[in-house]
Interface confidence: medium
């Protein structure tokens, strides 16, 4: 907490500027009206500032909104963003994408703060749902956005939004997330020829039920081995060992290395051993 | 599940030198380096096959890449000297219990595990 004092006479802040980098903590406070600060945000990254000084800049626009800024003041807060706190973000409505970006970008190289955290937060509960220009710009800033949200928060995005996803935006999902927005990617690309469906759907396979996968053995997909070994267990076990030779193609050899790994071992045992021999790998259920 | 961790990426001057490492938490007979540039197709770049140590290499590297192993380690490494612009990519390895002939085809389809990768920056 700043003490109250008068400013210095001729040290009144006219405008935002590089000469108050000068002034001490007790001058900012005394001479810097909150309202010019307010006006005059875009400003303040331009100046090197020390953390102090940015203390008592914030200190200003607590107190001038004490509910929350508004979104002209938040989308120009630049480094000033890295000093607020959950609790001040919560209090924030915020609408604009360009304003997100404009905070995403202070935060760029970062891991995921609970500021940001909160601030995402703040932002899609604003817009309803993960609309998919929100979901572009929060994937393209952490990759790992979108799982990282649960399954029921998840259920919000719509299908139209998965033309942003890119594969290794799926690389940290856990089954129960695929199992959410592997329908939504189904629905999304319906409407693509054979191969470029697969191409789409195949980072969301791991979601895919036990018909789905039989529909694609019967595409010619030559499914690689990373998305075979990621695919569900129960899924996997009904298949026949021609659908699985048709599913894979060439890539059919690679199941002899994988034989005692989920779900290849337990699909192994599911078959006949006369089916497993058709294969010519060795394969012993 | 099989775990691969790379390391080693970073930023270097065309013409300078790197080495990746990827450490493995199972072994498999064929362990191969890929590379992804941004909106460019994932491409093989080396593999070798653990049981006798053939390697392969993608045209574009050869001569100035080296792969190699430790197997005491489950331990993949790869040697990129010359570093061009072009190289510049994020490198991820791979492996699969592959025979020899298609662990030197270098098709990513047939690798069961991927890693998160380590990015490689090129300044001209």
């Known amino acids: 907490e700043v003490e109250k004092t008068a400013c210095p006479s001729g040290k009144k802040a006219r405008e935002i500027d590089e000469s108050l980098i000068f002034y001490k903590k007790w001058e900012l406070e005394a001479c810097v009206d909150a309202a010019l600060l307010a006006t005059q945000m875009d400003r303040v990254n331009a100046i090197p500032f020390t953390y102090e000084q940015l203390d008592v800049l914030k200190h200003k626009l607590d107190e001038l909104y004490p509910q929350g800024y508004p979104e002209s003041v938040i989308q120009h807060l630049g480094y000033l963003f890295l000093k607020m706190s959950p609790e001040d973000i919560r209090k924030w409505n915020v609408t604009s994408l360009e304003t997100l970006k404009a905070l995403l970008e202070v935060n760029k190289g970062h891991e995921m703060s609970p500021q940001v955290a909160t601030l995402i937060d703040r932002f899609v509960k604003g817009r309803g749902q993960l609309d998919k220009d929100t979901l572009d710009t929060l994937t393209a800033f952490y990759p790992g956005y979108l799982c990282s949200l649960s399954p029921e928060e998840l259920s919000s995005v719509p299908p139209s939004s998965i033309w942003a996803v890119r594969p290794q935006d799926l690389d940290t999902c856990d089954p129960r997330q695929l199992d959410v927005l592997y329908p939504k990617a189904r629905l999304a690309f319906q409407n693509m020829n054979g191969s470029e469906y697969f191409v789409k759907i195949q980072s969301f396979l791991g979601g895919a039920p036990t018909e789905d996968l039989k529909a694609l053995s019967q595409q010619n997909v030559s499914m690689d081995l990373a998305t075979f070994m990621k695919l569900r267990t129960d899924a996997v076990l009904p298949l026949t060992v021609a659908e699985v030779q048709k599913l894979l193609g060439p890539h059919v050899e690679g199941l002899k290395a994988e034989e005692r790994h989920r779900p290849v071992r337990d699909w192994i045992l599911r078959q006949r051993q006369d089916d497993l021999d058709t294969l010519g790998l060795g394969l012993q259920g | 599940e099989v775990q691969l961790v790379e390391s080693g990426g970073g930023s270097v001057q065309a013409g300078g030198s790197l080495t990746l490492s990827c450490a493995a938490s199972?072994?498999?007979?064929?362990m191969a380096w890929f590379r992804q540039a941004p909106g460019k197709a994932r491409e093989g770049v080396a593999s070798?096959?653990?049981?006798?140590?053939?390697?392969t290499y993608a045209d574009t590297v050869k001569g100035r890449f080296t792969i190699s192993q430790d197997n005491a380690k489950n331990t993949l490494y790869l040697q990129m000297n010359s570093l061009q612009p072009e190289d510049a990519a994020m490198y991820h390895c791979?492996?699969?219990?592959?025979?020899?002939?298609?662990?030197?085809?270098?098709?990513?389809?047939?690798?069961?595990?991927f890693g998160r990768g380590t990015q490689v920056t090129v300044s001209s």
């Open positions: 791979a492996i699969g219990g592959l025979s020899r002939n298609t662990c030197g085809y270098l098709r990513g389809g047939y690798f069961a595990y």
């Open positions: 199972e072994s498999r007979d064929c």
């Open positions: 070798i096959y653990a049981p006798d140590g053939s390697t």
